[in-house]
Each structure stands twice: as C-alpha cells, then as structure tokens.
C-alpha cells in the first residue's frame, strides 16, 4: 500500500478503532478532535502530569496520535545517519512518529506564553493551548502536509499557512492575570513589561463571561474573525511573541528584522485605547462599576485600536501593510467605536 | 536522502563575528525547524535555539540570547549562525539538526583565537 | 531551567553482555498529554550524535532493537541488550519539554 494511501487509513481511523464511526470519514473532523485532546506540551514541568485524556503512558505509546504517525513521513528516504554512514541499517522502523512541524510549532507557541505567563506573574488558560493547537492544524490542508519531506509537495500551500489564519486572535485569551495581580502595565516608550498581550490579557480577565456572551451574540464566522487577525509582514506572528532581546528590536538588517518578532515598545496608545488596570485592592463603587463594564464594552475597540497603532508603526518602517478587514468586521469595528 | 552540509571551519580572532551555514538537501527547510547545538571541546552538548525557516520566528537560550543569531535562506534551502564578539568561550563544535532532532549536520569546527 | 543529570561518566562493558545506562532530569518530563519528553542520542568519537529514542521510549527510524528506553517522570534508563563493538561513543539524554531544551552530561560506553 502508498504511504499517502497508508495516511489517509490512518487518518479515516480504519486503523485505529477507538475512531468514533461518524469520525471515520472526515479527515478534518477526526484530525481535530485528536488535536484538541492532544494539547501543546510545553509547559510548566511541575504542571500536574495526570493526561487528561485518560490514556496511561503505555496506552499512549501504542495508540500515539494519527496526526503525529500521518506528519512523520518526513523524508524520502528513512535515514537516520548524518550522511547515511549509520552503521545501523534500515533495519527497524520506528512505530511511532515524530512530531510534526505544526505541532512542534503550537508547542513552541504554548512554552513561550508558558514563559511570558511565569515572567509577567500569570496563570495560563490550558483550553487556550488547546484551542489554539485544534486551530493551527486544523487550517493546514492535512493531506498535503502530510509527505513532509518527500519531495512531493516541497511547495507551500500558501492558502492553508496564511498567519492570520493560523493564529486567531482568540489567542491572545492564553494568559489570565492571577487574582493577587495589582501590577500597573501601562505602555511605556522601550520599557520592557510594554507588551500588549498582557495588556490585552488583563483587561480580559476583567472583562470575565461577557466577552464569550458578545462573541456569541456577534457570531464571528472563522473567516471574519482571521481576516481580522493582526499579521506582521506576512510572517507567522502573533501576540505571543515578544522581542527576547534587545538586539532583535534593533537589527542592522530590514530582512533581519522582518524576520524576527516586532518591537511592541514603540506605539504610544491614546488614553481612552489604552487598557486601565485598576488596584484589586480599590473598593469599587458605583461608578467604577460602570467604567468597568464600559470598558468591557470598549476592549474589543480597544483591541483593534491597539493593533492599528502597531499598523501605523509597521507602515513607517516600510514594513509591507497586511491585507485589508473584511467589510463585515469594518462595520463591526465602526459601530463598535461609535459607541465609545 | 536527506544530508546537512555544514560550512568547513573556521579560525577567527577574538571580538569578531563569524556566520556558520547548514545547508539541507532531501528535503525543504520551511517544512521543519532547524535547531542549531555547541559541543565544547571534550564536553557536552549544549542548545542554543531554533529557527522556522519559513517565517523567521526564531528562539534562543537565554545564554546565547545576545550571542547568537540564527537565520535562514529558503531559497537556497540553508540555515545560518551568526556570532558577535566572538571570545575563547566560543571555540566549539556547533552542530545544525532538524526539528526532532533526527538528522545531524556534520558540524563546523570554529576556533577563536588571537 | 531543568537540570539533566547522567551519574555514570563511563561504563566499560564485554561485548555480548547487556549494559543500561541513566539519567535523571531535576523536573517531571510527563506532559499531560502521557508523553514523557526525553530523547537519547549516541555519539560515536568523530561523528556527529544520532537519535536513538525519542519520547522515552520509542525507537527512531534505523536503530536495532537491542535499544531500548524506559524511565517514570524524571529518572530514565537506555538499555543496550547484547552490546556490540559499534555501540561504543557517547550517550546523552535530552529534555525536549521546556525551554532551554537540555542535555545530560554523557556517559561514554567503552569497551573492556
């Protein structure tokens, strides 16, 4: 049988009998559902270890994700030598695959938010991690991804890796602010804590069940809500990612540059678009309440504010302007700021 | 097959820079990570970070966070590393590897020394 | 950053025989997904290292099944069953859970 043809078995679940028989059918469907159980690994070591998908280890070893025995076709040929000079054959494959690029990458994603999370005192969202992780995959064309390096597909599917597809702006929710949490992240010019997410995250843990209860009322359709995602140069940037270093904000090369992770230092918000964090400590009368719940209204404006500015920083280094909103969040985003 | 090539080696002076290259055949560097290692002389191995060739997105230990510079060329299938300042501290072997840690280039001698 | 630690700098063994060497990491590589982050290489004098198991305890692609891994959340063991000339370098394991991802010291397998 093909490898390709081996895959897509796999991946149907007729291997695999703990497929649900409805699943068995939809590639997507069951690749999801495996991704969504299987959530990004890198976090906290000390983390609870119990796998929450109710599998033991052993259980795991010989019932390892479709998705990682589908993505690890990944040569041509299986060698495991630097130059093929292994003294050790061909002889046993392994059964198990590795992991596959987007997974490694959701992975990558889930331990640097674990580390900003630990850096700035916040307490990670697992669901996040495993939304975010259903979401990347999800959105590559699954069978194509699979012949990894088989010399079959070495060309992109520019369609399927899009970055503002792939990281929805949901993601941004991954970080929860702790219940203790009084620091002041007001953006400054080059401070180092001015990083929006954990602005935006702050804010967002203020705004508790009423931002679910809004996206629901407003329905976003996948494709509205990643056509409104923030992508920097076409490269695969999300909010996650902050500059490591001072050199990486401050690269001779624009290709280097391009290539790294943006400085969020630099955009000055005006007051009413930048996110308030009020003392936990502050006895909240009435008209806090009120201001509160107003700026629960406005976080989403907030949101889109925060990233326009960024725009208009990017645009002034000729960095290429990410494509246009759809119409449909335009008018959201107007009728959302005349409101304010 | 799949093969890293690694750029022969090299001798510089201390406070130099120096760019080490990996270049891949048998396979297209956007379709995985590319990790870059140190092994000191008579010493073990050490991480210095990653790169996703198709979008730059790069990640570093934090020791070699200023140090280090890690880029990629898609369009002639090759990673790079790029040090600064280079010290007595960073005459190693540095190793290119694929994502999983699957397949090793042949490594790069760098010596630094006046 | 998670600490590995391989005690043994060396084991000198006869071929044929069976030897297993280990490494303990200072933190739990158990994700909660059940997968256990550790790899081990082989590092033969001269050569580059070689993937000989990943994710505690599966085979990589071309490696005999005289290697086996096996461990809990932060001690590991390599097992080589009947060991043979070219098995001689130096082993290291690798943490692939957290970043930075880390590598124990090695423990070199030599010969008697």
């Known amino acids: 049988m093909k490898r390709k043809e081996r895959i897509a078995r796999r991946l149907e679940g007729i291997e695999n009998d703990t497929q649900p028989i409805l699943l068995q059918s939809c590639t997507g469907l069951v690749t999801h559902r495996l991704l969504e159980e299987d959530t990004p690994r890198y976090m906290r070591a000390s983390d609870p270890a119990s796998p929450h998908i109710g599998r033991s280890n052993e259980e795991e070893e010989t019932s390892d994700s479709s998705l990682e025995k589908q993505t690890r076709s990944k040569y041509c040929t299986e060698t495991s030598g630097v130059h093929g000079d292994s003294p050790y054959g061909s002889g046993t494959m392994d059964t198990h695959s590795l992991e596959s690029k987007a997974e490694r990458i959701a992975r990558y994603k889930a331990e640097r938010r674990r580390q900003l999370a630990e850096k700035y005192g916040l307490t990670l969202d697992p669901e996040a991690d495993s939304e975010y992780l259903s979401r990347y995959t999800k959105s590559r064309k699954e069978p194509d991804a699979v012949e990894k390096r088989g010399g079959k597909s070495d060309k992109q599917e520019e369609s399927s890796r899009d970055a503002s597809s792939l990281y929805p702006g949901t993601e941004t929710m991954g970080l929860r602010t702790c219940a203790g949490e009084s620091k002041d992240y007001a953006l400054h010019v080059g401070d180092g804590s001015s990083d929006p997410e954990v602005l935006l995250n702050i804010e967002n843990q203020r705004r508790g069940q009423e931002l679910s209860a809004t996206r629901q009322a407003h329905d976003l359709s996948p494709a509205a809500e990643s056509s409104s995602t923030f992508s920097f140069s076409g490269r695969d940037s999300s909010f996650t990612e902050v500059p490591r270093s001072p050199k990486h904000a401050h690269s001779s090369s624009l290709q280097q540059a391009a290539s790294r992770s943006p400085s969020f230092g630099d955009p000055q918000l005006s007051p009413e678009a930048r996110p308030r964090c009020t003392s936990h400590s502050e006895t909240p009368t009435v008209d806090d309440e009120e201001k509160v719940d107003e700026r629960a209204k406005l976080s989403v404006a907030a949101k889109r504010l925060l990233f326009r500015e960024m725009e208009k920083s990017f645009d002034e280094q000729n960095v290429p302007k990410r494509r246009s909103r759809n119409t449909a969040v335009e008018q959201r985003l107007r009728r959302l700021q005349d409101r304010s | 097959e799949v093969q890293l090539q690694q750029s022969g080696a090299e001798l510089v002076r201390p406070g130099a820079s120096v760019k080490l290259s990996c270049t891949a055949s048998?396979?297209?560097?956007?379709?995985?990570?590319m990790h870059w290692v140190k092994q000191r002389p008579e010493q073990g191995l050490e991480w210095i970070g990653w790169?996703?060739?198709?979008?730059?997105?790069?990640e570093y230990a934090s020791k070699f966070q200023d140090k280090a510079t890690i880029t990629a060329d898609t369009s002639s299938n090759t990673a790079y590393l790029q040090f600064s300042s280079l010290t007595s501290e960073d005459t190693a072997v540095y190793y290119c590897?694929?994502?999983?840690?699957?397949?090793w280039g042949q490594g790069t001698t760098l010596t630094v020394s006046s | 950053d998670i600490v590995m630690t391989q005690a043994a700098p060396s084991i000198p063994v006869t071929p044929g025989q069976s030897v297993s060497i280990s490494c303990r990491s200072s933190?739990?590589?158990?994700?909660?997904?059940?997968?256990?982050?550790l790899y081990w290489f082989l590092q033969r004098p001269g050569q580059s290292p070689q993937l000989l198991i990943y994710?505690?305890?599966n085979l990589a692609s071309g490696v005999p099944d005289r290697f086996s891994g096996s461990g809990s959340a932060t001690a590991f063991t390599l097992r080589i069953s009947r060991v043979e000339a070219e098995d001689v370098g130096v082993y290291y394991c690798?943490?692939?859970?957290?970043?930075?991802?880390?590598f124990g010291a090695g423990t070199k397998l030599e010969l008697k």
């Open positions: 048998g396979f297209n560097i956007k379709d995985d990570h």
């Open positions: 590897t694929t994502g999983e840690f699957d397949n």
């Open positions: 933190k739990s590589l158990l994700h909660s997904n059940g997968n256990t982050y």
């Open positions: 690798m943490q692939h859970l957290e970043y930075p991802f880390s």
């Open positions: 790169i996703d060739p198709e979008n730059g997105d790069t």
């Open positions: 994710r505690m305890s």
